[in-house]
Interface confidence: medium
Protein backbone atom coordinates (compact mmCIF):
# COMPACT_ATOMS: atom_id res chain seq x y z
CA UNK A 1 0.00 0.00 0.00
CA UNK A 2 1.16 3.57 -0.54
CA UNK A 3 2.75 4.86 2.64
CA UNK A 4 0.27 7.68 3.10
CA UNK A 5 -2.71 5.31 3.13
CA UNK A 6 -3.60 4.00 6.57
CA UNK A 7 -7.24 4.46 7.49
CA UNK A 8 -10.35 3.17 5.77
CA UNK A 9 -11.67 3.98 3.31
CA UNK A 10 -8.61 3.95 1.05
CA UNK A 11 -7.95 2.99 -2.54
CA UNK A 12 -5.68 -0.07 -2.57
CA UNK A 13 -3.00 -0.64 -5.16
CA UNK A 14 -4.90 -2.08 -8.13
CA UNK A 15 -5.18 -5.83 -7.74
CA UNK A 16 -3.95 -5.92 -4.15
CA UNK A 17 -6.09 -7.27 -1.33
CA UNK A 18 -7.47 -5.32 1.59
CA UNK A 19 -6.25 -5.89 5.13
CA UNK A 20 -7.77 -8.06 7.84
CA UNK A 21 -11.28 -6.89 8.86
CA UNK A 22 -11.61 -4.88 5.66
CA UNK A 23 -13.41 -5.66 2.42
CA UNK A 24 -13.09 -4.34 -1.11
CA UNK A 25 -16.16 -2.40 -2.19
CA UNK A 26 -16.36 -2.69 -5.97
CA UNK A 27 -18.65 0.31 -6.32
CA UNK A 28 -16.56 2.67 -4.19
CA UNK A 29 -13.31 1.03 -5.42
CA UNK A 30 -12.10 1.26 -1.84
CA UNK A 31 -10.96 -0.91 1.03
CA UNK A 32 -13.55 -0.32 3.73
CA UNK A 33 -14.06 -1.46 7.30
CA UNK A 34 -16.09 -4.59 7.98
CA UNK A 35 -18.63 -4.47 10.80
CA UNK A 36 -17.82 -6.35 14.03
CA UNK A 37 -19.81 -9.33 15.33
CA UNK A 38 -23.17 -8.11 16.63
CA UNK A 39 -23.44 -5.42 13.96
CA UNK A 40 -24.36 -5.08 10.27
CA UNK A 41 -23.82 -2.54 7.49
CA UNK A 42 -26.28 0.32 7.79
CA UNK A 43 -24.56 2.34 5.05
CA UNK A 44 -21.90 1.05 2.67
CA UNK A 45 -18.77 3.13 2.28
CA UNK A 46 -18.09 5.57 -0.53
CA UNK A 47 -14.97 7.40 -1.64
CA UNK A 48 -15.04 9.79 1.31
CA UNK A 49 -16.78 8.04 4.20
CA UNK A 50 -16.31 4.63 5.75
CA UNK A 51 -18.82 1.87 6.38
CA UNK A 52 -21.51 2.80 8.91
CA UNK A 53 -22.38 -0.13 11.21
CA UNK A 54 -25.38 -0.60 13.47
CA UNK A 55 -26.30 -3.08 16.19
CA UNK A 56 -28.36 -6.11 15.29
CA UNK A 57 -31.95 -5.89 16.45
CA UNK A 58 -33.56 -8.31 18.93
CA UNK A 59 -33.49 -11.97 17.84
CA UNK A 60 -30.90 -11.18 15.17
CA UNK A 61 -27.14 -11.80 15.14
CA UNK A 62 -23.86 -11.67 13.22
CA UNK A 63 -21.11 -13.96 14.44
CA UNK A 64 -18.17 -12.74 12.32
CA UNK A 65 -16.63 -9.51 11.04
CA UNK A 66 -18.88 -8.85 8.08
CA UNK A 67 -20.25 -6.65 5.32
CA UNK A 68 -23.81 -8.00 5.65
CA UNK A 69 -26.70 -5.74 4.72
CA UNK A 70 -28.85 -7.41 7.41
CA UNK A 71 -28.24 -9.49 10.49
CA UNK A 72 -29.18 -13.15 10.51
CA UNK A 73 -32.28 -14.35 12.32
CA UNK A 74 -31.71 -16.47 15.39
CA UNK A 75 -33.14 -19.98 15.25
CA UNK A 76 -36.60 -20.39 16.73
CA UNK A 77 -36.97 -21.19 20.42
CA UNK A 78 -35.95 -24.64 21.58
CA UNK A 79 -38.75 -27.22 21.59
CA UNK A 80 -40.10 -28.94 24.70
CA UNK A 81 -37.79 -31.94 24.22
CA UNK A 82 -34.73 -29.68 23.98
CA UNK A 83 -32.61 -27.58 26.31
CA UNK A 84 -31.06 -24.23 25.34
CA UNK A 85 -27.33 -24.52 25.84
CA UNK A 86 -26.51 -21.14 24.25
CA UNK A 87 -28.85 -18.17 24.16
CA UNK A 88 -29.53 -15.96 21.14
CA UNK A 89 -27.46 -12.78 21.46
CA UNK A 90 -26.39 -10.07 19.00
CA UNK A 91 -23.20 -12.04 18.40
CA UNK A 92 -24.35 -15.66 18.34
CA UNK A 93 -27.22 -17.87 17.35
CA UNK A 94 -29.26 -19.88 19.82
CA UNK A 95 -28.06 -23.47 20.26
CA UNK A 96 -30.47 -26.21 21.31
CA UNK A 97 -29.51 -29.68 22.49
CA UNK A 98 -31.64 -32.72 23.15
CA UNK A 99 -32.71 -33.49 26.69
CA UNK A 100 -31.59 -36.72 28.38
CA UNK A 101 -32.95 -39.85 26.72
CA UNK A 102 -33.04 -38.27 23.25
CA UNK A 103 -30.61 -37.82 20.35
CA UNK A 104 -30.39 -35.28 17.55
CA UNK A 105 -31.82 -36.66 14.33
CA UNK A 106 -31.40 -33.39 12.37
CA UNK A 107 -28.69 -30.81 13.00
CA UNK A 108 -28.42 -27.23 11.70
CA UNK A 109 -25.28 -25.83 10.07
CA UNK A 110 -24.43 -24.07 13.32
CA UNK A 111 -24.49 -27.32 15.30
CA UNK A 112 -27.83 -26.72 16.98
CA UNK A 113 -30.44 -29.47 16.95
CA UNK A 114 -33.53 -29.10 14.79
CA UNK A 115 -35.20 -32.42 15.61
CA UNK A 116 -34.75 -34.70 18.62
CA UNK A 117 -35.77 -38.36 18.71
CA UNK A 118 -36.13 -40.77 21.58
CA UNK A 119 -33.04 -42.96 22.03
CA UNK A 120 -33.44 -46.54 20.82
CA UNK A 121 -33.75 -49.20 23.52
CA UNK A 122 -31.75 -52.42 23.55
CA UNK A 123 -33.84 -55.49 24.39
CA UNK A 124 -32.90 -58.56 26.49
CA UNK A 125 -29.74 -60.21 25.19
CA UNK A 126 -28.44 -56.89 23.90
CA UNK A 127 -26.57 -54.13 25.68
CA UNK A 128 -25.76 -50.52 24.83
CA UNK A 129 -22.45 -50.32 22.92
CA UNK A 130 -19.74 -47.97 24.15
CA UNK A 131 -19.83 -46.03 20.86
CA UNK A 132 -22.80 -44.21 19.36
CA UNK A 133 -24.22 -44.29 15.84
CA UNK A 134 -23.08 -41.40 13.59
CA UNK A 135 -26.37 -39.60 14.28
CA UNK A 136 -25.93 -39.95 18.05
CA UNK A 137 -28.45 -42.72 18.55
CA UNK A 138 -27.73 -45.71 20.75
CA UNK A 139 -26.06 -48.75 19.17
CA UNK A 140 -27.02 -52.16 20.52
CA UNK A 141 -24.64 -55.14 20.57
CA UNK A 142 -25.33 -58.75 21.40
CA UNK A 143 -24.07 -59.72 24.81
CA UNK A 144 -20.86 -61.72 24.52
CA UNK A 145 -20.46 -65.13 26.23
CA UNK A 146 -20.19 -64.59 29.96
CA UNK A 147 -22.34 -61.46 29.87
CA UNK A 148 -26.06 -60.73 29.77
CA UNK A 149 -28.73 -58.05 29.74
CA UNK A 150 -32.24 -58.82 30.97
CA UNK A 151 -33.68 -55.31 30.48
CA UNK A 152 -35.09 -53.14 27.69
CA UNK A 153 -33.09 -49.96 28.09
CA UNK A 154 -31.29 -47.15 26.29
CA UNK A 155 -28.57 -47.07 28.96
CA UNK A 156 -27.93 -50.59 30.28
CA UNK A 157 -24.81 -52.41 29.12
CA UNK A 158 -24.17 -56.15 29.15
CA UNK A 159 -23.12 -57.23 32.63
CA UNK A 160 -20.96 -60.22 33.55
CA UNK A 161 -22.72 -63.37 34.78
CA UNK A 162 -22.42 -63.90 38.50
CA UNK A 163 -19.72 -66.36 39.51
CA UNK A 164 -21.00 -69.36 41.45
CA UNK A 165 -19.02 -71.85 43.52
CA UNK A 166 -21.77 -74.34 42.52
CA UNK A 167 -23.72 -73.49 39.38
CA UNK A 168 -27.43 -74.35 39.35
CA UNK A 169 -28.47 -72.81 36.01
CA UNK A 170 -25.94 -71.43 33.54
CA UNK A 171 -26.51 -67.88 32.37
CA UNK A 172 -27.15 -66.90 28.76
CA UNK A 173 -27.29 -63.61 26.88
CA UNK A 174 -30.54 -62.55 28.49
CA UNK A 175 -30.38 -64.13 31.94
CA UNK A 176 -27.89 -64.24 34.75
CA UNK A 177 -26.45 -67.48 36.06
CA UNK A 178 -28.26 -69.08 39.05
CA UNK A 179 -26.08 -70.41 41.83
CA UNK A 180 -26.96 -73.54 43.81
CA UNK A 181 -27.38 -72.98 47.54
CA UNK A 182 -24.25 -73.92 49.44
CA UNK A 183 -24.72 -76.77 51.92
Amino acid sequence: LPAQVAFTPYAPEPGSTCRLREYYDQTAQMCCAKCPPGQYVKHFCNKTSDTVCADCEASMYTQVWNQFRTCLSCSSSCTTDQVEIRACTKQQNRVCACEAGRYCALKTHSGSCRQCMRLSKCGPGFGVASSRAPNGNVLCKACAPGTFSDTTSSTDVCRPHRICSILAIPGNASTDAVCAPES
Epitope: P2, A11, E13, P14, G15, Y24, Q26, T27, Q29, K47
Partner: antibody, heavy 116, light 107 residues
Protein backbone atom coordinates in the same frame (compact mmCIF):
# COMPACT_ATOMS: atom_id res chain seq x y z
CA UNK B 1 -0.91 -15.57 -13.76
CA UNK B 2 -3.83 -13.20 -14.22
CA UNK B 3 -5.38 -13.22 -17.68
CA UNK B 4 -8.44 -11.82 -19.43
CA UNK B 5 -9.02 -13.69 -22.69
CA UNK B 6 -11.61 -12.28 -25.09
CA UNK B 7 -13.47 -13.96 -27.94
CA UNK B 8 -12.32 -13.51 -31.52
CA UNK B 9 -13.02 -10.81 -34.09
CA UNK B 10 -16.55 -10.55 -35.48
CA UNK B 11 -17.93 -9.23 -38.77
CA UNK B 12 -21.63 -8.39 -38.61
CA UNK B 13 -24.29 -6.75 -40.76
CA UNK B 14 -26.15 -3.63 -39.60
CA UNK B 15 -29.12 -4.53 -37.38
CA UNK B 16 -27.53 -7.78 -36.16
CA UNK B 17 -26.32 -8.53 -32.61
CA UNK B 18 -22.95 -9.51 -31.24
CA UNK B 19 -21.88 -10.99 -27.91
CA UNK B 20 -18.26 -10.60 -26.81
CA UNK B 21 -16.95 -12.85 -24.03
CA UNK B 22 -14.14 -12.18 -21.57
CA UNK B 23 -12.86 -15.16 -19.58
CA UNK B 24 -10.90 -14.30 -16.44
CA UNK B 25 -8.34 -16.54 -14.75
CA UNK B 26 -5.68 -16.28 -12.06
CA UNK B 27 -7.73 -14.35 -9.49
CA UNK B 28 -11.07 -14.45 -7.66
CA UNK B 29 -13.48 -13.26 -10.33
CA UNK B 30 -16.13 -11.90 -7.95
CA UNK B 31 -13.72 -9.61 -6.07
CA UNK B 32 -13.10 -7.01 -8.76
CA UNK B 33 -15.52 -5.11 -10.97
CA UNK B 34 -15.25 -5.63 -14.75
CA UNK B 35 -15.10 -2.54 -16.95
CA UNK B 36 -15.79 -2.38 -20.69
CA UNK B 37 -13.95 0.10 -22.88
CA UNK B 38 -14.47 0.89 -26.58
CA UNK B 39 -11.89 2.17 -29.04
CA UNK B 40 -13.03 3.13 -32.54
CA UNK B 41 -10.39 2.85 -35.32
CA UNK B 42 -7.74 5.54 -34.85
CA UNK B 43 -9.64 7.04 -31.90
CA UNK B 44 -9.24 7.26 -28.15
CA UNK B 45 -10.65 5.19 -25.28
CA UNK B 46 -14.33 5.41 -24.27
CA UNK B 47 -15.53 4.02 -20.93
CA UNK B 48 -18.74 2.09 -21.62
CA UNK B 49 -19.52 1.08 -18.03
CA UNK B 50 -18.91 -1.80 -15.70
CA UNK B 51 -20.54 -4.75 -13.98
CA UNK B 52 -20.37 -5.61 -10.29
CA UNK B 53 -19.11 -9.18 -10.47
CA UNK B 54 -20.52 -10.23 -7.09
CA UNK B 55 -24.06 -8.86 -7.45
CA UNK B 56 -24.24 -8.85 -11.26
CA UNK B 57 -25.51 -5.25 -11.29
CA UNK B 58 -24.37 -3.33 -14.40
CA UNK B 59 -23.73 0.43 -14.71
CA UNK B 60 -23.74 2.01 -18.18
CA UNK B 61 -22.37 5.33 -19.40
CA UNK B 62 -25.14 7.41 -20.99
CA UNK B 63 -23.96 6.75 -24.55
CA UNK B 64 -24.12 3.01 -23.93
CA UNK B 65 -27.59 2.69 -22.42
CA UNK B 66 -30.26 0.77 -24.33
CA UNK B 67 -28.51 -1.39 -26.92
CA UNK B 68 -25.73 -2.67 -24.67
CA UNK B 69 -25.95 -5.36 -21.98
CA UNK B 70 -23.27 -6.56 -19.57
CA UNK B 71 -23.80 -10.03 -18.09
CA UNK B 72 -21.82 -12.65 -16.17
CA UNK B 73 -21.39 -16.37 -15.79
CA UNK B 74 -19.62 -16.61 -12.45
CA UNK B 75 -19.40 -20.42 -12.72
CA UNK B 76 -16.92 -19.98 -15.59
CA UNK B 77 -15.52 -16.57 -14.49
CA UNK B 78 -16.72 -15.03 -17.73
CA UNK B 79 -18.10 -11.56 -18.43
CA UNK B 80 -20.13 -10.79 -21.55
CA UNK B 81 -20.92 -7.63 -23.50
CA UNK B 82 -23.85 -7.89 -25.89
CA UNK B 83 -24.61 -5.21 -28.46
CA UNK B 84 -27.92 -5.25 -30.35
CA UNK B 85 -29.11 -3.41 -33.47
CA UNK B 86 -25.56 -2.91 -34.71
CA UNK B 87 -24.71 0.24 -36.68
CA UNK B 88 -21.66 1.06 -38.75
CA UNK B 89 -20.39 3.44 -36.05
CA UNK B 90 -20.22 0.52 -33.61
CA UNK B 91 -17.16 -0.70 -35.51
CA UNK B 92 -14.45 -0.70 -32.86
CA UNK B 93 -12.19 -2.75 -30.63
CA UNK B 94 -14.00 -3.65 -27.41
CA UNK B 95 -11.90 -4.30 -24.30
CA UNK B 96 -12.81 -5.88 -20.99
CA UNK B 97 -10.66 -4.67 -18.11
CA UNK B 98 -10.40 -5.62 -14.45
CA UNK B 99 -11.36 -2.99 -11.92
CA UNK B 100 -12.34 0.64 -12.19
CA UNK B 101 -9.77 2.57 -10.17
CA UNK B 102 -6.50 2.04 -12.03
CA UNK B 103 -7.53 -0.68 -14.49
CA UNK B 104 -4.62 -3.07 -14.09
CA UNK B 105 -5.44 -5.97 -16.43
CA UNK B 106 -6.97 -5.73 -19.89
CA UNK B 107 -8.23 -8.28 -22.36
CA UNK B 108 -6.51 -8.39 -25.75
CA UNK B 109 -9.51 -6.67 -27.33
CA UNK B 110 -12.18 -7.90 -29.74
CA UNK B 111 -12.59 -6.16 -33.08
CA UNK B 112 -16.24 -5.89 -34.10
CA UNK B 113 -16.72 -4.78 -37.70
CA UNK B 114 -20.17 -3.71 -38.84
CA UNK B 115 -20.48 -3.69 -42.59
CA UNK B 116 -23.21 -4.32 -45.13
CA UNK C 1 -19.75 14.54 -17.53
CA UNK C 2 -16.17 15.36 -16.58
CA UNK C 3 -14.03 16.22 -19.61
CA UNK C 4 -10.36 15.26 -19.45
CA UNK C 5 -8.27 17.43 -21.80
CA UNK C 6 -4.77 16.29 -22.65
CA UNK C 7 -2.01 18.44 -24.08
CA UNK C 8 -0.17 18.52 -26.30
CA UNK C 9 -1.94 16.27 -28.82
CA UNK C 10 1.47 15.27 -30.19
CA UNK C 11 4.86 15.56 -28.55
CA UNK C 12 8.02 15.07 -30.62
CA UNK C 13 11.14 14.33 -28.58
CA UNK C 14 14.38 12.38 -28.82
CA UNK C 15 15.49 9.43 -26.67
CA UNK C 16 17.10 10.64 -23.46
CA UNK C 17 14.96 13.79 -23.27
CA UNK C 18 12.38 14.56 -20.59
CA UNK C 19 8.69 14.32 -21.51
CA UNK C 20 5.96 16.24 -19.69
CA UNK C 21 2.35 15.37 -20.52
CA UNK C 22 -0.56 17.38 -19.15
CA UNK C 23 -4.12 16.37 -18.31
CA UNK C 24 -6.76 18.84 -17.11
CA UNK C 25 -10.13 17.84 -15.64
CA UNK C 26 -13.21 20.04 -16.13
CA UNK C 27 -14.14 19.44 -12.46
CA UNK C 28 -12.37 18.41 -9.27
CA UNK C 29 -11.50 14.70 -9.43
CA UNK C 30 -9.37 14.77 -6.23
CA UNK C 31 -6.60 12.25 -7.10
CA UNK C 32 -8.73 9.67 -8.93
CA UNK C 33 -6.62 9.84 -12.08
CA UNK C 34 -4.76 7.03 -13.82
CA UNK C 35 -2.32 7.12 -16.72
CA UNK C 36 -2.15 4.46 -19.43
CA UNK C 37 0.29 3.72 -22.23
CA UNK C 38 -0.93 2.19 -25.50
CA UNK C 39 1.13 0.90 -28.39
CA UNK C 40 -0.32 0.09 -31.83
CA UNK C 41 -2.33 -3.15 -31.86
CA UNK C 42 -2.04 -3.59 -28.09
CA UNK C 43 -4.31 -3.07 -25.10
CA UNK C 44 -3.60 -0.11 -22.79
CA UNK C 45 -1.15 -0.65 -19.92
CA UNK C 46 -1.54 0.92 -16.48
CA UNK C 47 1.37 3.18 -15.49
CA UNK C 48 0.12 5.44 -12.68
CA UNK C 49 -2.94 5.24 -10.41
CA UNK C 50 -4.18 7.65 -7.76
CA UNK C 51 -2.45 10.50 -9.66
CA UNK C 52 1.03 9.72 -8.31
CA UNK C 53 1.37 6.02 -7.46
CA UNK C 54 3.52 4.03 -9.85
CA UNK C 55 1.95 0.65 -10.64
CA UNK C 56 3.87 -2.56 -9.93
CA UNK C 57 6.66 -3.20 -12.45
CA UNK C 58 6.58 0.27 -14.01
CA UNK C 59 10.08 1.79 -14.36
CA UNK C 60 11.03 4.65 -12.03
CA UNK C 61 11.46 7.07 -14.96
CA UNK C 62 7.64 7.33 -15.03
CA UNK C 63 6.12 9.61 -12.41
CA UNK C 64 2.75 11.26 -11.87
CA UNK C 65 1.72 14.34 -9.97
CA UNK C 66 -1.20 16.68 -9.43
CA UNK C 67 -4.57 16.83 -7.74
CA UNK C 68 -8.03 18.38 -8.19
CA UNK C 69 -8.00 19.45 -11.86
CA UNK C 70 -4.35 19.55 -13.03
CA UNK C 71 -2.32 16.39 -13.53
CA UNK C 72 1.07 15.64 -15.08
CA UNK C 73 2.83 12.52 -16.31
CA UNK C 74 6.61 12.89 -16.52
CA UNK C 75 9.05 10.54 -18.22
CA UNK C 76 12.47 11.60 -16.96
CA UNK C 77 14.63 10.13 -19.71
CA UNK C 78 12.88 8.73 -22.77
CA UNK C 79 13.72 5.22 -23.88
CA UNK C 80 12.97 3.94 -27.41
CA UNK C 81 10.16 1.75 -26.07
CA UNK C 82 8.39 4.76 -24.49
CA UNK C 83 7.14 6.17 -27.80
CA UNK C 84 3.42 5.45 -27.77
CA UNK C 85 0.06 7.07 -27.04
CA UNK C 86 -0.65 8.08 -23.44
CA UNK C 87 -4.14 8.47 -21.94
CA UNK C 88 -5.27 9.92 -18.62
CA UNK C 89 -8.56 8.76 -17.13
CA UNK C 90 -10.67 9.77 -14.14
CA UNK C 91 -12.59 7.34 -11.94
CA UNK C 92 -14.03 9.86 -9.49
CA UNK C 93 -17.56 10.12 -10.79
CA UNK C 94 -19.76 8.46 -13.42
CA UNK C 95 -19.36 8.33 -16.27
CA UNK C 96 -15.64 7.63 -15.98
CA UNK C 97 -13.84 9.38 -18.79
CA UNK C 98 -10.52 9.33 -20.63
CA UNK C 99 -8.58 12.13 -22.23
CA UNK C 100 -8.23 12.12 -26.01
CA UNK C 101 -4.60 10.99 -25.74
CA UNK C 102 -1.12 12.41 -26.30
CA UNK C 103 0.99 10.83 -29.03
CA UNK C 104 4.64 10.73 -28.05
CA UNK C 105 6.70 10.36 -31.20
CA UNK C 106 10.40 10.21 -32.02
CA UNK C 107 11.80 13.52 -33.26
Amino acid sequence: QIQLVQSGAEVKKPGASVKVSCKASGYTFTTYGMSWVRQAPGQGLEWMGWIHTYSGVPTYADDFKGRFAFTLDTSTSTAYMELRSLRSDDTAVYYCARGLYGVDYWGQGTLVTVSS
Amino acid sequence: EIVMTQSPATLSLSPGERATLSCKASENVVTYVSWYQQKPGQAPRLLIYGASNRYTGIPARFSGSGSATDFTLTISSLQPEDFAVYYCGQSYTYPYTFGQGTKLEIK
